[in-house]
């Protein structure tokens, strides 16, 4: 199933591609060359470095096996934004074989609250929330090459789609009302 | 000039389009229908609502004519993320006639520091920083339809490009201990 980051909006392409026309895990070449190379998109570009450092994969729930870190100023002098933030996040690799790119780096907030800058510890008086952004992807689904209702094995049609991807976290005043 | 949000990466398309082939301010139809509709991307989708409420345009500098706000306790109850954040931001419409989409909503941090949750005032002990994200756009440039070196008036070639767009702000510990 595609990630449920927001309701996707799509536009279908018309052609049904055979397995021979598609490289392993790739989208149709003309769709790739008509647009910029996807690996330049941040959620894609991050994947290689995450894999190199052995980051977690796929659909473990948010905060699964993680804890809100204690922020020590001396340790974050050279750290990246996602580690220096008082609503820190990490990146997880989300994999979907029916999507191109198959792998995306998505942000997960590490804390429910935010980190108190004085103590370095989490405070529940503030909330960490995800910042979502749209990303253009291709989605494939089985199709028929002979005009029948039944899909032809190994054949796929593609449509482009915007999905909502969490790209980071921000610290907010909580919104509770009666 | 294109916005300087990060080094763009591009891929050129081959065809040189005449003015007659292009609707006003639009990209070539086949490039638009091959991909999802751009208006579904958040930086594009926000433009209409920003224009409806009379938001600022174009290249005024960051923080021009703004001040770091304090959200009243009763306003916190129903405000959006960008207002409830302790590193609040607003959206500005960036316009570039040689880009499709021509108008994008980009985030600008309203504070240099962050809002202190105890006092409701800005504190310099923390910094607001932009969160950048990649967005796929089309860029047009003059081209020659007759094979000469000189561009044909009103004719354009298009290439797709990823640009880095600020989508929000997060509150971080400063890099310097000074």
């Amino acid at each position: 199933d595609p990630p449920s980051w927001g309701k996707p909006r799509s536009h279908r392409t018309l052609r049904c591609y055979s397995a021979e026309e598609l490289s392993h895990g790739q989208a149709p070449p003309h769709l790739l060359t008509r647009s910029a190379r996807w690996e330049q998109a941040l959620p894609v570009a991050l994947v290689a470095s995450l894999e190199a450092t052995g980051h977690r994969r796929q659909h473990e729930g948010p905060l699964a096996g993680t804890q809100c870190p204690v922020l020590r100023p001396e340790e974050v002098l050279e750290a990246d934004t996602h580690e220096r933030s008082i609503s820190p996040w990490r990146y997880r690799i989300d994999t979907d074989e029916n999507r191109y790119p198959q792998k995306l780096a998505v942000a997960e907030c590490l804390c429910r609250g935010c980190i108190n800058a004085k103590t370095g510890r989490e405070t529940a008086a503030l909330n960490s929330v995800q910042l979502l952004q749209s990303l253009l992807v291709l989605r494939r689904q089985p199709c028929s090459r002979d005009g029948t209702a039944d899909p032809t094995p190994g054949s796929f049609a593609f449509h482009t789609e915007f999905i909502r991807v969490p790209v980071g976290c921000t610290c907010v005043l909580p919104r509770s009302t009666q | 000039d294109p916005p300087s949000w990060g080094k763009p990466r591009s891929h050129r398309t081959l065809r040189c389009y005449s003015a007659e082939e292009l609707s006003h301010g639009q990209a070539p139809p086949h490039l638009l229908t091959r991909s999802a509709r751009w208006e579904q991307a958040l930086p594009v989708a926000l433009v209409a609502s920003l224009e409806a409420t009379g938001h600022r345009r174009q290249h005024e500098g960051p923080l021009a004519g703004t001040q770091c706000p304090v959200l009243r306790p009763e306003e916190v109850l129903e405000a959006d993320t960008h207002e409830r954040s302790i590193s609040p931001w607003r959206y500005r419409i960036d316009t570039d006639e040689n880009r499709y989409p021509q108008k994008l909503a980009v985030a600008e941090c309203l504070c240099r520091g962050c809002i202190n949750a105890k006092t409701g005032r800005e504190t310099a002990a923390l910094n607001s920083v932009q969160l950048l994200q990649s967005l796929l756009v089309l860029r047009r440039q003059p081209c020659s339809r007759d094979g000469t070196a000189d561009p044909t008036p009103g004719s354009f070639a298009f290439h797709t490009e990823f640009i880095r767009v600020p989508v929000g702000c997060t509150c971080v510990l400063p890099r310097s201990t000074q």
């Epitope: 609250g113 405070t123 529940a124 008086a125 909330n127 005043l173 909580p174 919104r175 509770s176 009302t177 009666q178 | 304090v70 959200l71 009243r72 306790p73 009763e74 916190v76 109850l77 129903e78 949750a117 105890k118 006092t119 409701g120 005032r121």
Partner: antibody, heavy 120, light 112 residues
């Protein structure tokens, strides 16, 4: 030490006015939002109003809106509540209380209270 | 009518533990760990005992603890002592009409 001390309570007729004061000491008064909270005899606590640290922002419970005015003088470390058009149901002990987070009901320092009685 | 519901009274013997509940809705108590608890002895001002649902201000005994389950916040007092006899109030965010709401209060009686 950190403390708030209320004054100005007393007996007043319905329709009358009264001005309560709250003197702060032992902390940086101008850094904190302050609220007035009241307690009718034998009843529970009821939030009445807040004022921001600078004094530029105020807010009132519906029950007192238009009749009560909260203000502060940071130079004097003082908070005030001007109460007009008083009613019998305004009879209560009035407390000033410091908010430890400006947008949350965490009142970490309270005054001893001052009794306001509205009766003919 | 308070937006936060507390039992009118609870009692316990010295040394025992008691729990006072504070029930709200999914959008106040249920959404965030933002409940605070106050102790009030007769004729005295309230005193903050718990904030952020479970944190104790300095000077408050560790016999007092706060927790939350669903839409209900709870204050637990262990090793009950005579001086714990008092009224206890919970508080949370309210609405634009009443910004901060208190529970109706619970009278704690220490028996014997």
């Amino acid at each position: 030490q950190v403390q708030l001390v209320e004054s100005g309570g007393g007996l007043v007729k319905p329709g009358g006015s009264l001005r309560l004061s709250c003197a702060a000491s032992g902390f940086t008064f101008s850094d904190h939002y302050i609220s007035w909270i009241r307690q009718a005899p034998g009843k529970g606590l009821e939030w009445v109003s807040y004022i921001s640290s600078s004094g530029s922002t105020t807010y009132y419970a519906e029950s007192v809106k238009g009749r009560f005015t909260i203000s502060r003088d940071n130079a004097k470390n003082s908070l005030y509540l001007q109460m007009n058009s008083l009613r019998a149901e305004d009879t209560a002990v009035y407390y000033c209380a410091r908010q430890s987070y400006y947008f949350l009901p965490y009142f970490d320092v309270w005054g001893q209270g001052t009794l306001v009685t509205v009766s003919s | 009518q308070s937006a936060l519901t507390q039992p009118a009274s609870v009692s316990g013997s010295p040394g025992q533990s008691i729990t006072i509940s504070c029930t709200g809705t999914s959008s106040d108590v249920g959404s965030y760990n933002l409940v605070s608890w106050y102790q009030q002895h007769p004729g005295k001002a309230p005193k903050l005992m718990i904030y952020e649902g479970s944190k104790r201000p300095s000077g408050v005994s560790n016999r007092f603890s706060g927790s939350k389950s669903g839409n209900t916040a709870s204050l637990t007092i262990s090793g009950l002592q005579a001086e714990d006899e008092a009224d206890y109030y919970c508080a949370s965010r309210g609405s634009r009409r009443v910004l901060y709401v208190f529970g109706g209060g619970t009278k704690l009686t220490v028996l014997g």
